[in-house]
Amino acid sequence: IWELKKDVYVVELDWYPDAPGEMVVLTCDTPEEDGITWTLDQSSEVLGSGKTLTIQVKEFGDAGQYTCHKGGEVLSHSLLLLHKKEDGIWSTDILKDQKEPKNKTFLRCEAKNYSGRFTCWWLTTISTDLTFSVKSSRGSSDPQGVTCGAATLSAERVRGDNKEYEYSVECQEDSACPAAEESLPIEVMVDAVHKLKYENYTSSFFIRDIIKPDPPKNLQLKPLKNSRQVEVSWEYPDTWSTPHSYFSLTFCVQVQGKSKREKKDRVFTDKTSATVICRKNASISVRAQDRYYSSSWSEWASVPCS
Amino acid sequence: RNLPVATPDPGMFPCLHHSQNLLRAVSNMLQKARQTLEFYPCTSEEIDHEDITKDKTSTVEACLPLELTKNESCLNSRETSFITNGSCLASRKTSFMMALCLSSIYEDLKMYQVEFKTMNAKLLMDPKRQIFLDQNMLAVIDELMQALNFNSETVPQKSSLEEPDFYKTKIKLCILLHAFRIRAVTIDRVMSYLNAS
């Protein structure tokens, strides 16, 4: 058993049918010695008396808010949560496996630049009685500071019969140098509590590996005289790290017909313009990627050919 | 994805082309190592990230873009001093900081070159003959060093009398390649910045 926060405790259980569970001793936080009784949640049934209560915690029915009273007055509370260990592996019931970029990915994180700011998000099908708390650091043995805000519900989606909820959090490394070469990964820890179930999820990454630039901005077309060709031009996104000559991007320019089946023409360039043939009803899209370290491509910025 | 091949025009900062080749070569070598050594811990998540140039060179600090010198988090100690007569310096661009930066890059390359050559000698003794260093990568390191053209004491190749532990050598190769790729990215960023200056 360990303390998650004041008066909230997590009991770790080896979870299998007929498991013996864990013996837990609760102590009433009071100078009083006599006439103390214990109850669980809203029930008035007296579970025991005395300054300490010994219970055998086996299942969720044994978890909850234990309260000690004296003469009708509440003295203190202890909330017991359960953390299930199933055959050596902590349970992951609360969050959905996003399966990207690999199986068992519960937390996904992205950064728009090298400033040390990043966003993480996760999915769940649970709509109520759910709380999250996020901590982060650079490295784990001698951790350096990363400050995270509160996790918020950022999207709701319908997937088949189920509703899916997306939560996200923004974090900022306290003293980040955009040009630094990372040798210690960022660690992100999410505590999730659903009713009386506790779970924790972690992710470890280098900012350089989670970079995903915003799409190029100011995408424009300039027709070339006496030609079906157009000059496409764009700019670096505002959120990208500066100076751009140091944090350079490379671009992919794509001409896509109305039909998805039509052949796509693609050009790669390090410049912020390109000359392409603009077909009728086609659209031109441009996306960006770090020129020197192949992390994710940005989303496409698009303009119609007409 | 193969990095775009830049064909340098004659007026171009001469080291940019070599640094792009270097990044391409080390990225290819790392990819090859990860495929060949699939049963070894060779991914970024599995290895310890060690920097063999730590406390010996200060490339990130010495090559920091002017715009980032206002960022206190970027300003660690800048104590290392180097020889300053590189041929990549077009005379009009010569500055003490730039010379310091390029000589720091040169020292990095020299240290990695020695490590890679020593390691290759060990790998050649492996009866499994599983992996060797790409000669192209070693040649590209050499070319960039020549383009930088700094006078520097030659570092003798390390020789080891004891029987090599091939498992450890291969893991060390992965660690080295990951670190060198990160340094090659920094070198490429620096050359691109200097070229634009």
Partner: antibody, heavy 115, light 112 residues
Framework: QVQLVQSGGGVVQPGRSLRLSCAAS????????MHWVRQAPGKGLEWVAF????????YYADSVKGRFTISRDNSKNTLYLQMKSLRAEDTAVYYC????????WGQGTMVTVSS | SYVLTQPPSVSGTPGQRVTISCSGG????????VKWYQQLPGTAPKLLIY???QRPSGVPDRFSGSKSGTSASLAITGVQAEDEADYYC????????????FGTGTKVTVLG
């Protein structure tokens, strides 16, 4: 006392269907994940499928994906394996078992796929 | 499809020490717990070892398990006639958990 009693096995022709049941007693069935494991005659153990305690997630071996469906009825304390498009290579003893460090197995039920 | 490799058979005379190896990789045994099962002819497997080296109550102490790196082993010190059976190791793969990974199985023969 934890008990898993299996039923539903038998002889079936290739291409036909069969549903296996596993009745649980002696524990809170709705709190635990459950597996199906099979063993072809004279062969080793092969995992078939898993279902979470609440039925929210199901996992299958590649060899049965798209043909077999694992399900549970927590109000009846019963686990099921619906097997469709059966093949000769599905011939095996099928076991249900609880998920956890200490596990309990059903007695097994023989499924023979033969024309 | 078996990722955990066991020797097909091992044998020993009563009282001898018999060991069965189970070889895997970094993503399975290297990062998950190992179990061992005993299966007598015509019966369901019986759990012998869980959590790499833990013995459930009721399992004789002559059975012991260990794990090192990407391999595990089961030892029977002082093998007895009633130990003649098939033995299976089991683990998980970190990418496909909770799918069970079983070893190829080892037939233990007690001679004489």
């Amino acid at each position: 006392q934890v008990q898993l009693v299996q039923s539903g096995g038998g002889v079936v022709q290739p291409g036909r269907s069969l549903r296996l049941s596993c009745a649980a007693s002696g524990f809170t069935f709705s709190s635990y994940g459950m597996h199906w494991v099979r063993q072809a005659p004279g062969k080793g153990l092969e995992w078939v499928a898993f279902i979470r305690y609440d039925g929210s997630n199901k996992y299958y071996a590649d060899s049965v994906k798209g043909r077999f469906t694992i399900s549970r009825d927590n109000s009846k304390n019963t686990l099921y394996l619906q097997m469709k498009s059966l093949r000769a290579e599905d011939t095996a003893v099928y076991y249900c078992k609880t998920h956890g460090s200490h596990d309990n197995w059903g007695q097994g039920t023989m499924v023979t796929v033969s024309s | 499809s078996y990722v955990l490799t066991q020797p097909p058979s091992v044998s020993g005379t009563p009282g001898q020490r018999v060991t069965i190896s189970c070889s895997g990789g970094r993503s399975n045994i290297g990062s998950n717990v190992v179990k061992w099962y005993q299966q007598l002819p015509g019966t369901a497997p019986k759990l012998l070892i869980y959590g790499n080296d833990q013995r459930p109550s009721g399992v004789p102490d002559r059975f012991s398990g260990s794990k090192s790196g990407t391999s595990a082993s089961l030892a029977i010190t002082g093998v007895q006639a009633e130990d003649e059976a098939d033995y299976y190791c089991q683990s998980y793969d970190r990418g496909t958990h909770p799918a069970l990974l079983f070893g190829t199985g080892t037939k233990v023969t007690v001679l004489g």
